[in-house]
């Protein structure tokens, strides 16, 4: 059978949700010693780095300038050392947001619930679409979707102290196309234990897989990295 | 403070129709769902509906979804209830109130309608 | 539509004393259950919120008890300005009802 290296990991860097005409970066973190990356967009070929030097850095960024609904889809990369090539990483949505209209969200019953209580988000964009995406800050990974014509609810049932947080919701054109961002609208949801008090709301982290941990080589990491080639070697 | 400020009374003939305002006040009026009420001495209250000014979403009891139209003009910050064929079993006062925190926690002093020929 | 009855329209108290308004929904509504105050010529006041929660500013001698379908409002040593309309109501699900109304009566 045919040997292939592992998988590289392919990053959006700080969003994958990039408003139209900014500049995207996507990482792709492969082995130190990779000679080539190469990103492919829809299947095709879309950019090829080299890094330099290729045995001191263990993967490459890719700028994607002008951010349209074009050059919005499924990207996935792939690395070589040597002659040999890599398997496919997974794939990576790139969103292009701003397009067209602004849709407005809001939550019901109120944005101070209690613990238990049945919430549902309304999200509402005059404009043809028939998708509508919610997401909670810090975790734009986590997207719900729902259909309707001019609205879509989002019902989150009977919600917890883990609903807290902001919220935003955009109109979708198409998968990879999306509206301005509506404003925030922040949920605030008290404990069965407390009383009037508000508790605070939980802090949100940007998305931890929304950076690129490309890094530079050491001596003890050139040892590790050639020791692990080795052992693959040794098991295969 | 927060303030729902409703005209007193309204008298109108049977048949007609009549638009009940509340200015509101004291908070965002985007942000909080208006709430329409009935209140008809002997009758106990009756939920009308609701709507959302930010993007004038809105729930109503199906018993009043034929009898009652709600709006809002975010511009002046007042929310309206439309009333339209009215009969003798519409005179009753009519409260806007607002839920900022939990349950209905700020009401209107209500508007009485009397349907009279 | 979920019913909320208050059996007792009227309650008879002396001040001092301790008195309990009970509302009954027809079917479950968790706890998702308000309390509210109308004394004449006013609009109504919510006290009580999710059963129990007391609103600030409402004092202590009102608390809110109960679960599922049946619930109580209950006021401890009754003062004079606790002469009201007293009233339910269920928002766990559409359309919102209200109880009928228990007034208290002041001896």
């Known amino acids: 059978p045919k040997q292939t290296l592992p998988k590289p990991i392919i990053r959006a860097e700080s969003t994958y949700m990039v408003p139209k005409e900014k500049q995207a970066t996507l990482c792709c973190q492969g082995s130190y010693g990779a000679v080539e990356y190469q990103l492919h967009f829809e299947g095709s070929l879309f950019a090829v780095e080299r890094p330099k030097p290729p045995e001191r850095i263990n993967g490459v960024k890719f700028h994607i300038p002008d951010m349209n609904s074009r050059k919005a889809g499924r990207y996935s990369c792939i690395y070589r050392v040597g002659e040999l090539w890599s398997e496919r990483s997974d794939l990576l949505d790139l969103v292009v947001t701003e397009m067209y209209d602004t849709p407005t969200l809001s939550v019901h019953p109120g944005p101070e619930v209690t613990s238990g209580e049945k919430v549902t988000f309304y999200c509402r964009l005059d404009t043809a679409t028939s998708m509508f995406l919610l997401l909670k800050e810090g975790r734009s990974r986590d997207v719900q979707r729902s259909y309707g014509k001019v609205q879509a609810e989002f019902p989150m049932g009977p919600v917890t102290t883990a609903h807290r947080g902001s919220y935003r919701c955009f109109g979708s054109y198409n998968n990879y196309a999306w509206s301005f961002p509506s404003e925030p609208v922040k949920l605030l949801v008290t404990g069965d234990i407390e009383n009037t008090s508000l508790a605070p709301t939980d802090p949100t982290f940007p998305d931890s897989w929304d950076t690129c941990l490309l890094t530079r080589e050491t001596g003890l990491q050139k040892d590790l990295a050639l020791w692990d080639h080795t052992a693959q070697n040794l098991l295969r | 403070q927060v303030q729902l400020q409703q005209p007193g009374a309204e008298l109108v003939k049977p048949g007609a129709s009549v638009k009940l305002s509340c200015k509101a006040s004291g908070y965002t009026f985007t942000s909080y769902w208006m709430h329409w009420v009935k209140l008809r001495p002997g009758q106990g209250f009756e939920w009308?509906?609701?709507?959302?000014?930010?993007?004038?979403?809105?729930n109503y009891n199906e018993k009043f979804k034929r009898k009652a139209t709600l709006t809002v003009d975010k511009s002046s910050s007042t929310a309206y209830m439309q009333l339209s064929s009215l009969t003798s079993e519409d005179s009753a006062v009519y409260y806007c109130t607002i839920r900022l925190r939990y349950a209905l926690d700020y009401w209107g002093q209500g508007t009485s309608v009397t349907v009279s020929a | 539509d979920i019913v909320m009855t208050q059996s007792q329209k009227f309650m008879s108290t002396s001040v001092g004393d301790r008195v309990s308004v009970t509302c009954k929904a027809s079917?479950?509504?968790?706890?998702?259950v308000a309390w509210y105050q109308q004394k004449p010529g006013q609009s109504p006041k919510a006290l009580i919120y999710s059963t129990s929660f007391r609103y600030s500013g409402v004092p202590d001698r009102f608390t809110g008890s109960g679960s599922g379908t049946d619930f109580t409002l209950t006021i401890s040593n009754v003062q004079s300005e606790d002469l009201a309309e007293y009233f339910c109501q269920q928002y766990n699900s559409y359309p919102f009802t209200f109880g009928s109304g228990t007034k208290l009566e002041i001896k």
């Open positions: 079917q479950n509504v968790g706890t998702n």
């Open positions: 009308i509906g609701e709507i959302i000014p930010s993007n004038g979403v809105t």
